[in-house]
């Protein structure tokens, strides 16, 4: 969920050096505080539909709007996989796709957004009812996922709107790299806010907004912003509310939601172990794990329909030296 | 050195138990997908099982499912299979393999097995 | 479940000739193929993945072809060591299939 700050709007103070500072010292915070609010979560989009010739057949679209670059996209159905949820499929920008029945297939449509199209025969096959979710692994967020299901009155070819994120899991990664730089503006911020309390302000026009604490809201992404992103078919639908965190409850709802505790400490061996270990600089990561892809330049990229690569968070390791112990 | 070791086969009555393990050893464990895959003797390689490195997101083939668990205890390095209500038709050399790709933190696999364990026979008869 | 079926069952040839192995895919797996050697007693080997992309330490003689649904080993000058079964592995979609091997043996 990202948040956006309303910032109170200021008019010019009298001329002067001490009006211009103090201009400045009110107008910098408030920029710092609209950005630190609003540049540092990610969202992810769901989209459902059923297709109007074959009733049980589905398409699954998800998007990633964030900044960071996607590592790995995983598609699960009746919940997130490890929380009762079931992998459909996983797609890796570089290193391709691995899909499981009854996906029938997967791609990426942009660098940040992927389609599934599912079979529809056979006891695996998809019910209208059922909850799709994706989730992004991405640099320096972490992970985030999002889920979505059709509307019980859905009819065929219709789709559901795109869900704004439930986000179920934001990795420690994400406090680093620009997550960190933000925080670290954000206590800069509180000083500046801090230090101009003991101040005397500059006279201002009487304003409806006194310049205190703005308001945080629920922010959804408008048509421009998505435009902005150019990320298909993310249409929010600005009228449902997200789902969150507080929706888990034990004894009602989709059974999957009871579990989400243990979803979001499920790899404990993840970014969060970063934390506690020295974090090389993007890109001068070697590892000699991967011994099997030694041979430089014998690897093909795997790349979806007009897809450029981005890099891993951990730094390229898609052809390595010989196997060894890291 | 880099290797994997199996153990815990052995001869079983038709219905009964076994628990195999799987010990690595020269490289880091928790980074790799592993998967459990048999021969049975004379015939082709059937995958059974798998584990995801750090998450311990668990697969399994459809003649093994509800029958056979697979987990994982990173800090010793070791793999393990408890095989329940086993059948004839379960007989087989146990290999364990480890995925060609290191990941610790997305989660990908290749799904590819670069590292194989020498097996271990199991064979279920009465 | 992909089905893998690869022809011929047996092939047998001398050391030094050219071995070309076939393995067909029951639907589409993109590149996502991988062959291994067995020998008897001893466990599989990965010689190629991605449909032609060798594995560490395995030599220039052998080498992958093919996409979609079909696929070629070849080794193109059979040494002593080379006689043994090969497996084709789909892992495009999951649970990975194996074809039922080739076993290639000294005429």
């Known amino acids: 969920m990202r948040t956006e700050a309303q910032v109170p709007a200021l008019q010019p103070p009298e001329p002067g050096l001490e009006g211009a500072m103090g201009h400045r010292t009110l107008v910098l915070p408030w920029v710092l505080l609209t950005l630190c609010v609003t540049a540092g979560t990610p969202e992810v989009w769901v989209q459902v539909r059923m297709e109007a010739t074959e009733l049980s057949s589905f398409t699954i679209r998800c998007g990633f709007l964030g900044s960071g670059s996607i590592s790995l996209v995983t598609v699960s159905w009746g919940g997130p996989n490890g929380a009762g949820g079931t992998t459909l499929a996983v797609l890796h920008p570089e290193r391709g796709i691995r899909q499981w029945a009854p996906a029938r297939q997967a791609r990426w449509e942009t660098q940040s957004s992927i389609s599934l199209i599912l079979e529809g025969s056979g006891a695996s096959s998809p019910c209208a009812n059922t909850t799709f979710c994706c989730k992004f692994a991405s640099f320096p967020e972490g992970s985030w996922e999002a889920c979505g299901s059709l509307p019980p009155s859905s009819d065929p070819g219709l789709s559901a709107p795109p869900t704004p994120a439930p986000i179920l899991r934001a990795d420690l990664a994400g406090i680093l790299g620009v997550s960190g730089v933000l925080l670290f503006g954000c206590v800069y911020l509180l000083h500046l806010l801090r230090r101009h309390k003991h101040r005397p302000a500059p006279r201002l026009q009487p304003s409806r907004t006194s310049p205190q604490a703005p308001r945080a809201r629920a922010w959804a992404p408008s048509q421009a912003s998505q435009a902005a992103l150019h990320v298909p078919y993310a249409t929010i639908n600005t009228s449902c509310r997200p789902a969150t965190l507080d929706t888990a409850h034990p004894h009602g709802g989709p059974s999957w939601w009871a579990s989400l505790p243990t979803h979001a400490a499920h790899r404990p061996q993840g970014p969060a172990a970063w934390a506690s270990t020295p974090i090389p600089a993007r890109g001068s990561f070697v590892s000699v794990e991967n011994g099997l892809y030694a041979q430089a330049g014998e690897r093909p990229p795997h790349t979806g329909p007009g897809l450029t690569l981005f890099p891993d968070p951990r730094g390229p390791r898609a052809m390595e030296g010989p196997l060894g112990v890291r | 050195e880099v290797q994997l070791l199996e153990s815990g086969g052995g001869l079983v009555q038709p219905g009964g138990s076994l628990r195999l393990s799987c010990a690595a050893s020269?490289?880091?464990?928790?980074?790799?997908?592993m998967s459990w895959v048999r021969q049975a003797p004379g015939k082709g390689l059937e995958w059974v099982s798998a584990i995801s490195g750090s998450a311990g997101e668990t697969y399994y083939a459809d003649s093994v499912k509800g029958r056979f668990t697979i987990s994982r205890d990173n800090s010793k390095n070791t793999l393990y299979l408890q095989m329940n209500s086993l059948r004839a038709e379960d007989t087989a050399v146990y290999y364990c393999?480890?995925?060609?790709?290191?990941?610790?933190?997305?989660?990908?696999?290749?799904?590819?097995?670069?590292?194989w364990g020498r097996g271990t026979l199991v064979t279920v008869s009465s | 479940e992909i089905v893998l079926t690869q022809s011929p069952a047996t092939l047998s040839l001398s050391p030094g000739e050219r071995a070309t192995l076939s393995c067909r895919a029951s639907q589409s797996v993109s590149r996502y193929l991988a062959w291994y050697q067995q020998k008897p007693g001893q466990a599989p080997r990965l010689l190629i993945y991605?449909?032609?992309n060798r594995a560490t330490g395995i030599p220039a003689r052998f080498s992958g072809s093919g996409s979609g649904t079909d696929f070629t080993l070849t080794i193109s000058s059979l040494e002593p060591e080379d006689f043994a079964v090969y497996y084709c592995?789909?892992?495009?979609?999951?649970?990975?299939?194996f074809g039922g091997g080739t076993k290639v043996e000294i005429k």
């Open positions: 592995q789909q892992v495009s979609l999951l649970p990975p299939t």
């Open positions: 020269g490289f880091t464990f928790s980074g790799h997908l």
């Open positions: 991605d449909a032609s």
């Open positions: 393999a480890r995925d060609a790709y290191y990941d610790d933190w997305s989660g990908w696999a290749d799904w590819y097995f670069d590292l």
